[in-house]
Protein backbone atom coordinates (compact mmCIF):
# COMPACT_ATOMS: atom_id res chain seq x y z
CA UNK A 1 0.00 0.00 0.00
CA UNK A 2 1.34 3.46 -0.81
CA UNK A 3 2.04 6.10 1.80
CA UNK A 4 -0.43 8.94 1.42
CA UNK A 5 -1.12 12.44 2.66
CA UNK A 6 -4.58 13.92 2.23
CA UNK A 7 -5.65 17.50 2.94
CA UNK A 8 -9.32 18.40 3.22
CA UNK A 9 -9.85 22.20 3.45
CA UNK A 10 -13.33 23.64 3.93
CA UNK A 11 -14.46 27.28 3.84
CA UNK A 12 -18.01 28.57 4.26
CA UNK A 13 -20.14 31.45 3.04
CA UNK A 14 -23.37 32.78 4.49
CA UNK A 15 -25.79 34.78 2.33
CA UNK A 16 -22.99 35.47 -0.17
CA UNK A 17 -20.50 36.59 2.48
CA UNK A 18 -17.39 34.42 2.89
CA UNK A 19 -16.78 33.49 6.52
CA UNK A 20 -13.38 34.22 8.08
CA UNK A 21 -12.80 30.75 9.51
CA UNK A 22 -11.64 27.60 7.77
CA UNK A 23 -11.20 23.97 8.70
CA UNK A 24 -8.52 21.58 7.47
CA UNK A 25 -8.34 17.88 8.21
CA UNK A 26 -5.15 16.04 7.33
CA UNK A 27 -5.01 12.25 6.97
CA UNK A 28 -1.71 10.39 6.94
CA UNK A 29 -1.83 6.85 5.52
CA UNK A 30 -5.61 6.97 5.86
CA UNK A 31 -5.49 7.87 9.55
CA UNK A 32 -6.79 11.17 11.01
CA UNK A 33 -3.58 13.06 11.65
CA UNK A 34 -4.07 16.81 12.04
CA UNK A 35 -7.03 19.09 12.48
CA UNK A 36 -6.43 22.77 11.80
CA UNK A 37 -8.44 25.94 12.01
CA UNK A 38 -7.24 29.53 11.53
CA UNK A 39 -5.88 29.58 15.07
CA UNK A 40 -3.73 26.45 15.06
CA UNK A 41 -3.22 22.85 14.04
CA UNK A 42 -3.58 20.08 16.58
CA UNK A 43 -2.66 16.42 16.40
CA UNK A 44 -5.92 14.66 15.71
CA UNK A 45 -5.62 10.95 16.51
CA UNK A 46 -6.50 9.91 20.03
CA UNK A 47 -4.99 7.15 22.11
CA UNK A 48 -1.58 5.64 22.61
CA UNK A 49 -0.49 5.83 18.96
CA UNK A 50 -0.72 9.62 18.92
CA UNK A 51 1.19 9.96 22.17
CA UNK A 52 3.88 7.45 21.27
CA UNK A 53 4.49 8.59 17.73
CA UNK A 54 3.63 12.26 17.66
CA UNK A 55 4.97 13.14 21.10
CA UNK A 56 4.72 16.80 22.06
CA UNK A 57 5.44 18.09 18.57
CA UNK A 58 4.17 21.57 17.77
CA UNK A 59 2.58 22.22 14.39
CA UNK A 60 3.53 25.89 13.84
CA UNK A 61 4.75 25.35 10.28
CA UNK A 62 1.67 23.37 9.31
CA UNK A 63 -0.56 26.04 10.90
CA UNK A 64 1.20 28.76 8.89
CA UNK A 65 1.06 26.88 5.58
CA UNK A 66 -2.51 25.73 5.95
CA UNK A 67 -3.69 29.17 7.08
CA UNK A 68 -2.32 30.47 3.75
CA UNK A 69 -4.19 27.73 1.92
CA UNK A 70 -7.36 28.61 3.80
CA UNK A 71 -7.06 32.26 2.72
CA UNK A 72 -6.58 31.17 -0.91
CA UNK A 73 -9.66 28.99 -0.75
CA UNK A 74 -11.72 31.80 0.80
CA UNK A 75 -10.71 34.06 -2.10
CA UNK A 76 -11.74 31.32 -4.53
CA UNK A 77 -15.13 30.97 -2.86
CA UNK A 78 -15.66 34.75 -3.06
CA UNK A 79 -15.26 34.54 -6.86
CA UNK A 80 -17.94 31.90 -7.28
CA UNK A 81 -20.89 33.75 -8.78
CA UNK A 82 -23.37 31.11 -7.73
CA UNK A 83 -23.73 32.46 -4.18
CA UNK A 84 -27.34 32.15 -3.09
CA UNK A 85 -28.93 32.76 0.29
CA UNK A 86 -28.02 30.58 3.19
CA UNK A 87 -24.98 28.48 3.94
CA UNK A 88 -22.60 27.24 1.22
CA UNK A 89 -19.30 25.39 1.38
CA UNK A 90 -16.25 25.09 -0.82
CA UNK A 91 -13.97 22.14 -0.22
CA UNK A 92 -10.55 21.48 -1.65
CA UNK A 93 -9.16 17.98 -1.26
CA UNK A 94 -5.53 17.35 -2.09
CA UNK A 95 -3.99 13.90 -2.10
CA UNK A 96 -0.46 12.76 -2.78
CA UNK A 97 0.95 9.24 -2.68
CA UNK A 98 4.35 7.61 -2.70
CA UNK A 99 4.24 4.02 -3.94
CA UNK A 100 6.61 1.18 -3.12
CA UNK A 101 8.42 1.64 -6.42
CA UNK A 102 8.90 5.35 -5.49
CA UNK A 103 6.44 6.50 -8.15
CA UNK A 104 4.15 9.34 -7.08
CA UNK A 105 0.53 10.41 -7.64
CA UNK A 106 -1.04 13.75 -6.78
CA UNK A 107 -4.48 15.17 -7.34
CA UNK A 108 -6.67 18.08 -6.30
CA UNK A 109 -10.47 18.13 -6.15
CA UNK A 110 -12.97 20.94 -5.58
CA UNK A 111 -16.44 20.42 -4.11
CA UNK A 112 -19.21 23.01 -3.84
CA UNK A 113 -21.92 22.17 -1.28
CA UNK A 114 -20.47 18.67 -1.18
CA UNK A 115 -20.68 18.11 -4.94
CA UNK A 116 -17.52 17.49 -6.96
CA UNK A 117 -17.17 20.02 -9.80
CA UNK A 118 -13.47 20.15 -10.68
CA UNK A 119 -10.44 17.84 -10.44
CA UNK A 120 -6.81 18.24 -11.42
CA UNK A 121 -4.03 15.73 -11.83
CA UNK A 122 -1.20 17.72 -10.22
CA UNK A 123 1.45 15.81 -12.14
CA UNK A 124 0.05 16.21 -15.65
CA UNK A 125 -1.77 19.51 -14.81
CA UNK A 126 -4.81 17.99 -16.54
CA UNK A 127 -8.23 19.26 -15.43
CA UNK A 128 -11.42 17.16 -15.48
CA UNK A 129 -15.00 18.01 -14.53
CA UNK A 130 -18.33 16.19 -14.28
CA UNK A 131 -20.85 16.51 -17.11
CA UNK A 132 -23.61 18.32 -15.21
CA UNK A 133 -24.23 21.92 -16.28
CA UNK A 134 -23.97 23.21 -12.69
CA UNK A 135 -20.58 21.55 -12.25
CA UNK A 136 -19.38 22.92 -15.58
CA UNK A 137 -20.45 26.47 -14.64
CA UNK A 138 -18.72 26.27 -11.26
CA UNK A 139 -15.61 24.78 -12.86
CA UNK A 140 -15.36 27.57 -15.45
CA UNK A 141 -15.80 30.12 -12.66
CA UNK A 142 -13.00 28.72 -10.54
CA UNK A 143 -10.62 28.03 -13.43
CA UNK A 144 -11.05 31.56 -14.75
CA UNK A 145 -10.27 32.93 -11.30
CA UNK A 146 -7.15 30.79 -11.02
CA UNK A 147 -6.01 31.89 -14.48
CA UNK A 148 -6.58 35.57 -13.64
CA UNK A 149 -4.42 35.24 -10.57
CA UNK A 150 -1.39 33.96 -12.43
CA UNK A 151 0.90 34.68 -9.51
CA UNK A 152 -1.12 32.46 -7.22
CA UNK A 153 -1.37 29.78 -9.85
CA UNK A 154 2.42 29.68 -10.09
CA UNK A 155 3.26 29.99 -6.43
CA UNK A 156 0.52 28.01 -4.78
CA UNK A 157 -1.36 25.61 -7.01
CA UNK A 158 1.57 24.76 -9.25
CA UNK A 159 3.72 23.97 -6.21
CA UNK A 160 1.12 21.92 -4.37
CA UNK A 161 2.24 18.64 -5.86
CA UNK A 162 5.83 19.19 -4.73
CA UNK A 163 4.76 20.61 -1.34
CA UNK A 164 2.50 17.69 -0.54
CA UNK A 165 5.15 15.13 -1.44
CA UNK A 166 7.79 17.09 0.44
CA UNK A 167 5.61 17.08 3.57
CA UNK A 168 4.84 13.40 3.21
CA UNK A 169 8.54 12.56 2.83
CA UNK A 170 9.31 14.73 5.86
CA UNK A 171 6.76 12.86 7.97
CA UNK A 172 8.11 9.54 6.78
CA UNK A 173 11.67 10.54 7.58
CA UNK A 174 10.82 11.90 11.02
CA UNK A 175 9.22 8.60 12.01
CA UNK A 176 5.75 10.01 12.42
CA UNK A 177 4.51 7.26 10.11
CA UNK A 178 5.26 3.86 11.50
CA UNK A 179 4.32 0.80 9.50
CA UNK A 180 2.92 -0.63 12.68
CA UNK A 181 0.65 -3.65 12.98
CA UNK A 182 -1.98 -3.93 15.67
CA UNK A 183 -3.79 -7.29 15.66
CA UNK A 184 -7.56 -7.30 16.04
CA UNK A 185 -9.59 -8.39 19.01
CA UNK A 186 -12.18 -10.82 17.63
CA UNK A 187 -15.40 -11.79 19.34
CA UNK A 188 -18.36 -13.83 18.20
CA UNK A 189 -21.91 -13.28 19.41
CA UNK A 190 -25.19 -15.01 18.64
CA UNK A 191 -28.68 -13.63 18.48
CA UNK A 192 -32.13 -15.05 17.85
CA UNK A 193 -33.21 -14.52 14.25
CA UNK A 194 -36.30 -16.67 13.66
CA UNK A 195 -37.73 -20.06 14.50
CA UNK A 196 -34.91 -22.59 14.43
CA UNK A 197 -32.34 -20.08 13.18
CA UNK A 198 -29.78 -17.86 14.86
CA UNK A 199 -27.68 -15.01 13.54
CA UNK A 200 -24.01 -15.21 14.41
CA UNK A 201 -21.93 -12.05 14.26
CA UNK A 202 -18.15 -11.88 14.25
CA UNK A 203 -16.63 -8.54 15.25
CA UNK A 204 -13.00 -7.50 14.80
CA UNK A 205 -11.83 -4.32 16.49
CA UNK A 206 -8.70 -2.39 17.36
CA UNK A 207 -6.71 -3.46 14.32
CA UNK A 208 -4.25 -1.59 12.05
CA UNK A 209 -3.77 -1.34 9.12
CA UNK A 210 -7.35 -1.47 7.86
CA UNK A 211 -6.97 -4.41 5.41
CA UNK A 212 -8.62 -7.46 6.95
CA UNK A 213 -10.30 -10.68 5.86
CA UNK A 214 -13.25 -11.66 7.99
CA UNK A 215 -15.61 -14.41 6.87
CA UNK A 216 -17.72 -17.31 8.03
CA UNK A 217 -16.81 -20.92 7.22
CA UNK A 218 -18.85 -24.10 7.50
CA UNK A 219 -16.75 -27.19 8.20
CA UNK A 220 -13.72 -25.23 6.99
CA UNK A 221 -15.23 -24.10 3.67
CA UNK A 222 -16.02 -20.39 3.13
CA UNK A 223 -19.67 -19.45 2.88
CA UNK A 224 -20.58 -17.65 -0.34
CA UNK A 225 -20.67 -13.84 -0.29
CA UNK A 226 -24.43 -13.65 -0.64
CA UNK A 227 -25.00 -15.64 2.55
CA UNK A 228 -22.97 -13.20 4.64
CA UNK A 229 -23.52 -9.58 5.58
CA UNK A 230 -20.48 -7.36 6.08
CA UNK A 231 -20.09 -4.09 7.93
CA UNK A 232 -17.81 -1.38 6.61
CA UNK A 233 -14.27 -1.15 7.95
CA UNK A 234 -14.51 2.00 10.08
CA UNK A 235 -12.10 4.00 12.25
CA UNK A 236 -12.81 3.42 15.92
CA UNK A 237 -11.38 6.73 17.13
CA UNK A 238 -8.19 5.20 18.53
CA UNK A 239 -6.16 5.22 15.34
CA UNK A 240 -7.36 1.67 14.67
CA UNK A 241 -10.28 0.09 12.86
CA UNK A 242 -13.30 -2.13 13.42
CA UNK A 243 -15.63 -4.24 11.28
CA UNK A 244 -18.03 -7.20 11.47
CA UNK A 245 -19.54 -10.04 9.45
CA UNK A 246 -22.78 -11.88 10.14
CA UNK A 247 -24.61 -14.94 8.84
CA UNK A 248 -27.71 -16.94 9.67
CA UNK A 249 -27.36 -20.58 10.67
CA UNK A 250 -29.51 -23.43 12.00
CA UNK A 251 -29.72 -23.62 15.76
CA UNK A 252 -27.88 -26.73 16.93
CA UNK A 253 -25.21 -26.53 14.21
CA UNK A 254 -23.14 -23.80 15.84
CA UNK A 255 -20.08 -26.00 16.39
CA UNK A 256 -19.69 -26.43 12.63
CA UNK A 257 -19.30 -22.73 11.92
CA UNK A 258 -16.20 -20.65 12.53
CA UNK A 259 -15.31 -17.04 11.92
CA UNK A 260 -12.06 -16.85 9.97
CA UNK A 261 -9.89 -13.78 10.45
CA UNK A 262 -6.76 -12.86 8.52
CA UNK A 263 -4.78 -9.70 9.18
CA UNK A 264 -1.20 -8.75 8.26
CA UNK A 265 -0.24 -12.34 7.49
CA UNK A 266 -1.67 -13.76 10.72
CA UNK A 267 -4.88 -15.74 10.91
CA UNK A 268 -7.18 -17.23 13.50
CA UNK A 269 -10.50 -19.05 13.68
CA UNK A 270 -13.19 -18.30 16.22
CA UNK A 271 -16.03 -20.66 17.14
CA UNK A 272 -19.62 -19.71 17.88
CA UNK A 273 -20.16 -19.62 21.65
CA UNK A 274 -22.45 -22.39 22.83
CA UNK A 275 -25.23 -21.97 25.33
CA UNK A 276 -28.03 -19.56 25.83
CA UNK A 277 -28.86 -16.87 23.27
CA UNK A 278 -27.94 -13.60 24.94
CA UNK A 279 -28.58 -10.86 22.40
CA UNK A 280 -32.16 -10.58 21.16
CA UNK A 281 -31.58 -8.67 17.94
CA UNK A 282 -30.52 -9.26 14.37
CA UNK A 283 -28.49 -7.48 11.68
CA UNK A 284 -30.82 -9.11 9.17
CA UNK A 285 -34.04 -7.34 8.28
Amino acid sequence: EPHSLRYNLTVLSWDGSVQSGFLTEVHLDGQPFLRCDRQKCRAKPQGQWAEDVLGNKTWDRETRDLTGNGKDLRMTLAHIKDQKEGLHSLQEIRVCEIHEDNSTRSSQHFYYDGELFLSQNLETKEWTMPQSSRAQTLAMNVRNFLKEDAMKTKTHYHAMHADCLQELRRYLKSGVVLRRTVPPMVNVTRSEASEGNITVTCRASGFYPWNITLSWRQDGVSLSHDTQQWGDVLPDGNGTYQTWVATRICQGEEQRFTCYMEHSGNHSTHPVPSGKVLVLQSHWQ
Epitope: Q218, D219, G220, V221, S222, L223, S224, T227, C250, E253, Q255, R256, E262, G265, H267, P271
Partner: antibody, heavy 122, light 106 residues
Amino acid sequence: QVQLQESGGGLVQPGGSMRLSCGASGFTFSRYSMNWVRQAPGKGLEWLSYISSRSSTIYYADSVKGRFTISRDNAKNSLNLQMHSLRDEDTAVYYCARVSDITGNTGSFDIWGQGTTVTVSS
Amino acid sequence: EIVLTQSPSSLSASVGDRVTITCRASQSIHNYLNWYQQKPGKAPKLLIYAASSLQSGVPSRFSGSGSGTDFTLTISSLQPEDFATYYCQQSYSTLTFGGGTKLEIK
Protein backbone atom coordinates in the same frame (compact mmCIF):
# COMPACT_ATOMS: atom_id res chain seq x y z
CA GLN B 1 -23.80 -48.07 7.76
CA VAL B 2 -22.74 -44.69 6.35
CA GLN B 3 -22.81 -44.94 2.56
CA LEU B 4 -22.85 -42.96 -0.69
CA GLN B 5 -23.90 -44.56 -3.97
CA GLU B 6 -23.48 -42.87 -7.37
CA SER B 7 -25.64 -43.71 -10.39
CA GLY B 8 -26.45 -42.38 -13.86
CA GLY B 9 -23.11 -42.91 -15.58
CA GLY B 10 -22.73 -44.38 -19.06
CA LEU B 11 -21.87 -43.52 -22.63
CA VAL B 12 -22.79 -40.13 -24.08
CA GLN B 13 -21.89 -38.32 -27.31
CA PRO B 14 -19.85 -35.08 -27.29
CA GLY B 15 -22.18 -32.13 -26.83
CA GLY B 16 -24.71 -34.32 -25.04
CA SER B 17 -26.12 -34.15 -21.52
CA MET B 18 -26.20 -36.51 -18.56
CA ARG B 19 -27.49 -36.42 -14.99
CA LEU B 20 -25.64 -38.15 -12.17
CA SER B 21 -27.20 -38.92 -8.81
CA CYS B 22 -25.75 -39.84 -5.45
CA GLY B 23 -27.91 -41.54 -2.84
CA ALA B 24 -26.98 -41.20 0.84
CA SER B 25 -27.80 -43.58 3.68
CA GLY B 26 -26.78 -44.19 7.28
CA PHE B 27 -26.45 -40.51 8.23
CA THR B 28 -28.49 -37.30 8.36
CA PHE B 29 -27.85 -36.14 4.81
CA SER B 30 -29.34 -32.65 5.34
CA ARG B 31 -26.61 -31.81 7.86
CA TYR B 32 -23.69 -32.30 5.48
CA SER B 33 -22.11 -30.33 2.67
CA MET B 34 -21.39 -32.43 -0.41
CA ASN B 35 -19.04 -32.49 -3.43
CA TRP B 36 -18.50 -34.04 -6.82
CA VAL B 37 -14.95 -35.11 -7.68
CA ARG B 38 -13.81 -36.87 -10.85
CA GLN B 39 -10.83 -38.89 -12.00
CA ALA B 40 -9.96 -39.26 -15.68
CA PRO B 41 -8.37 -42.60 -16.67
CA GLY B 42 -4.81 -42.76 -15.34
CA LYS B 43 -5.03 -39.21 -13.96
CA GLY B 44 -5.35 -37.54 -10.57
CA LEU B 45 -8.38 -36.32 -8.63
CA GLU B 46 -10.17 -33.20 -9.85
CA TRP B 47 -12.65 -31.41 -7.61
CA LEU B 48 -15.70 -30.28 -9.58
CA SER B 49 -18.38 -28.78 -7.34
CA TYR B 50 -19.44 -28.11 -3.76
CA ILE B 51 -22.89 -27.56 -2.24
CA SER B 52 -23.50 -26.63 1.40
CA SER B 53 -26.00 -28.46 3.61
CA ARG B 54 -28.82 -26.00 2.87
CA SER B 55 -27.75 -25.29 -0.75
CA SER B 56 -26.97 -21.67 0.17
CA THR B 57 -23.33 -21.90 -0.94
CA ILE B 58 -22.38 -23.49 -4.25
CA TYR B 59 -18.96 -23.52 -5.92
CA TYR B 60 -17.69 -24.89 -9.24
CA ALA B 61 -14.27 -25.57 -10.71
CA ASP B 62 -13.49 -23.32 -13.69
CA SER B 63 -13.38 -26.36 -15.98
CA VAL B 64 -17.11 -27.07 -15.51
CA LYS B 65 -18.54 -23.65 -14.64
CA GLY B 66 -21.53 -22.87 -16.86
CA ARG B 67 -21.85 -26.49 -18.05
CA PHE B 68 -22.47 -28.45 -14.84
CA THR B 69 -25.09 -27.78 -12.15
CA ILE B 70 -25.00 -29.26 -8.66
CA SER B 71 -28.20 -29.64 -6.66
CA ARG B 72 -29.54 -31.62 -3.73
CA ASP B 73 -32.86 -32.84 -2.38
CA ASN B 74 -32.55 -33.23 1.38
CA ALA B 75 -36.00 -34.84 1.62
CA LYS B 76 -34.83 -37.60 -0.73
CA ASN B 77 -31.28 -37.86 0.61
CA SER B 78 -29.97 -37.24 -2.87
CA LEU B 79 -27.23 -35.23 -4.54
CA ASN B 80 -27.30 -34.50 -8.28
CA LEU B 81 -24.94 -33.31 -11.00
CA GLN B 82 -26.53 -32.14 -14.25
CA MET B 83 -23.94 -32.10 -17.03
CA HIS B 84 -24.39 -30.32 -20.38
CA SER B 85 -22.16 -29.73 -23.44
CA LEU B 86 -20.08 -32.77 -22.57
CA ARG B 87 -16.61 -33.08 -24.06
CA ASP B 88 -14.16 -35.94 -24.58
CA GLU B 89 -12.12 -34.65 -21.63
CA ASP B 90 -15.12 -35.12 -19.31
CA THR B 91 -14.60 -38.89 -19.56
CA ALA B 92 -13.87 -40.01 -16.00
CA VAL B 93 -15.03 -41.82 -12.90
CA TYR B 94 -17.29 -39.42 -10.98
CA TYR B 95 -17.36 -39.59 -7.17
CA CYS B 96 -19.65 -37.90 -4.68
CA ALA B 97 -18.01 -37.08 -1.36
CA ARG B 98 -19.23 -35.81 1.99
CA VAL B 99 -17.57 -32.95 3.87
CA SER B 100 -16.65 -34.01 7.39
CA ASP B 101 -18.39 -32.17 10.22
CA ILE B 102 -15.67 -32.84 12.78
CA THR B 103 -14.75 -29.79 14.87
CA GLY B 104 -11.71 -28.07 13.41
CA ASN B 105 -12.30 -29.53 9.96
CA THR B 106 -10.73 -27.81 6.97
CA GLY B 107 -13.08 -28.89 4.21
CA SER B 108 -11.96 -32.53 4.17
CA PHE B 109 -14.00 -35.32 2.55
CA ASP B 110 -14.54 -38.19 4.98
CA ILE B 111 -17.01 -40.38 3.07
CA TRP B 112 -16.82 -41.21 -0.65
CA GLY B 113 -18.99 -43.20 -3.02
CA GLN B 114 -17.53 -45.98 -5.14
CA GLY B 115 -17.82 -43.86 -8.31
CA THR B 116 -19.77 -44.03 -11.58
CA THR B 117 -18.10 -44.01 -14.99
CA VAL B 118 -18.98 -41.42 -17.62
CA THR B 119 -17.64 -41.99 -21.13
CA VAL B 120 -17.94 -39.17 -23.67
CA SER B 121 -17.30 -40.52 -27.15
CA SER B 122 -18.75 -40.48 -30.63
CA GLU C 1 -7.16 -20.55 -8.16
CA ILE C 2 -4.73 -22.02 -5.68
CA VAL C 3 -2.42 -24.61 -7.26
CA LEU C 4 -1.07 -27.49 -5.17
CA THR C 5 2.17 -29.06 -6.39
CA GLN C 6 3.10 -32.46 -4.99
CA SER C 7 6.57 -33.92 -5.04
CA PRO C 8 7.80 -36.35 -5.93
CA SER C 9 5.21 -37.48 -8.48
CA SER C 10 6.32 -41.06 -7.91
CA LEU C 11 8.47 -42.75 -5.32
CA SER C 12 9.85 -46.26 -4.74
CA ALA C 13 10.36 -47.49 -1.20
CA SER C 14 10.57 -50.65 0.87
CA VAL C 15 8.52 -51.97 3.76
CA GLY C 16 9.79 -50.39 7.00
CA ASP C 17 11.09 -47.24 5.27
CA ARG C 18 10.26 -43.76 6.47
CA VAL C 19 8.63 -41.85 3.60
CA THR C 20 7.93 -38.12 3.20
CA ILE C 21 5.68 -36.58 0.55
CA THR C 22 5.48 -32.82 0.13
CA CYS C 23 2.73 -30.52 -1.06
CA ARG C 24 3.40 -26.88 -1.92
CA ALA C 25 0.63 -24.28 -2.33
CA SER C 26 0.89 -21.38 -4.77
CA GLN C 27 -0.08 -19.02 -1.92
CA SER C 28 -0.53 -19.31 1.83
CA ILE C 29 -3.40 -21.59 2.79
CA HIS C 30 -2.54 -21.56 6.51
CA ASN C 31 -3.56 -25.03 7.74
CA TYR C 32 -6.44 -25.63 5.31
CA LEU C 33 -4.87 -28.78 3.91
CA ASN C 34 -5.96 -32.43 3.89
CA TRP C 35 -4.31 -35.69 2.78
CA TYR C 36 -5.89 -38.75 1.09
CA GLN C 37 -4.81 -42.24 0.13
CA GLN C 38 -6.19 -43.95 -2.99
CA LYS C 39 -5.67 -47.54 -4.09
CA PRO C 40 -6.30 -48.68 -7.69
CA GLY C 41 -10.01 -49.04 -8.50
CA LYS C 42 -11.04 -47.69 -5.10
CA ALA C 43 -12.34 -44.39 -3.78
CA PRO C 44 -9.93 -42.10 -1.91
CA LYS C 45 -9.68 -42.33 1.88
CA LEU C 46 -9.12 -39.38 4.23
CA LEU C 47 -5.92 -39.64 6.29
CA ILE C 48 -5.14 -36.18 7.67
CA TYR C 49 -7.21 -33.00 8.00
CA ALA C 50 -6.21 -29.49 9.06
CA ALA C 51 -2.59 -30.22 8.02
CA SER C 52 -1.77 -32.35 11.06
CA SER C 53 -4.92 -33.90 12.61
CA LEU C 54 -5.20 -37.66 12.19
CA GLN C 55 -8.58 -38.86 10.93
CA SER C 56 -10.28 -41.40 13.20
CA GLY C 57 -9.28 -44.98 12.37
CA VAL C 58 -6.09 -44.05 10.52
CA PRO C 59 -2.90 -45.72 11.84
CA SER C 60 -0.59 -43.46 13.84
CA ARG C 61 2.34 -44.14 11.49
CA PHE C 62 0.74 -41.45 9.27
CA SER C 63 1.41 -37.86 10.29
CA GLY C 64 1.08 -34.45 8.69
CA SER C 65 2.86 -31.17 9.28
CA GLY C 66 3.32 -27.73 7.82
CA SER C 67 1.53 -24.42 7.55
CA GLY C 68 1.33 -21.60 5.03
CA THR C 69 2.63 -22.94 1.72
CA ASP C 70 4.70 -26.04 2.58
CA PHE C 71 3.22 -29.27 3.91
CA THR C 72 4.43 -32.84 4.39
CA LEU C 73 2.84 -36.23 4.84
CA THR C 74 5.10 -38.70 6.63
CA ILE C 75 4.73 -42.47 6.92
CA SER C 76 7.07 -43.45 9.73
CA SER C 77 7.39 -47.13 8.84
CA LEU C 78 5.93 -48.33 5.55
CA GLN C 79 3.56 -51.29 5.65
CA PRO C 80 2.61 -53.39 2.60
CA GLU C 81 -0.91 -51.88 2.54
CA ASP C 82 0.51 -48.32 2.28
CA PHE C 83 1.57 -48.67 -1.36
CA ALA C 84 -0.94 -46.38 -3.07
CA THR C 85 -1.32 -42.89 -4.52
CA TYR C 86 -1.49 -39.94 -2.10
CA TYR C 87 -3.22 -36.61 -2.73
CA CYS C 88 -3.26 -33.31 -0.90
CA GLN C 89 -6.33 -31.03 -1.05
CA GLN C 90 -6.97 -27.47 0.11
CA SER C 91 -10.14 -25.63 1.15
CA TYR C 92 -8.67 -22.20 1.87
CA SER C 93 -10.07 -20.86 -1.40
CA THR C 94 -12.84 -23.04 -2.82
CA LEU C 95 -11.28 -26.50 -3.27
CA THR C 96 -8.45 -28.06 -5.28
CA PHE C 97 -6.37 -31.26 -5.25
CA GLY C 98 -2.68 -31.76 -5.80
CA GLY C 99 -1.47 -33.88 -8.74
CA GLY C 100 -0.78 -36.95 -6.62
CA THR C 101 2.26 -38.98 -5.53
CA LYS C 102 2.41 -42.67 -6.48
CA LEU C 103 4.18 -44.75 -3.85
CA GLU C 104 5.50 -48.03 -5.30
CA ILE C 105 7.34 -51.03 -3.92
CA LYS C 106 11.10 -50.93 -4.56
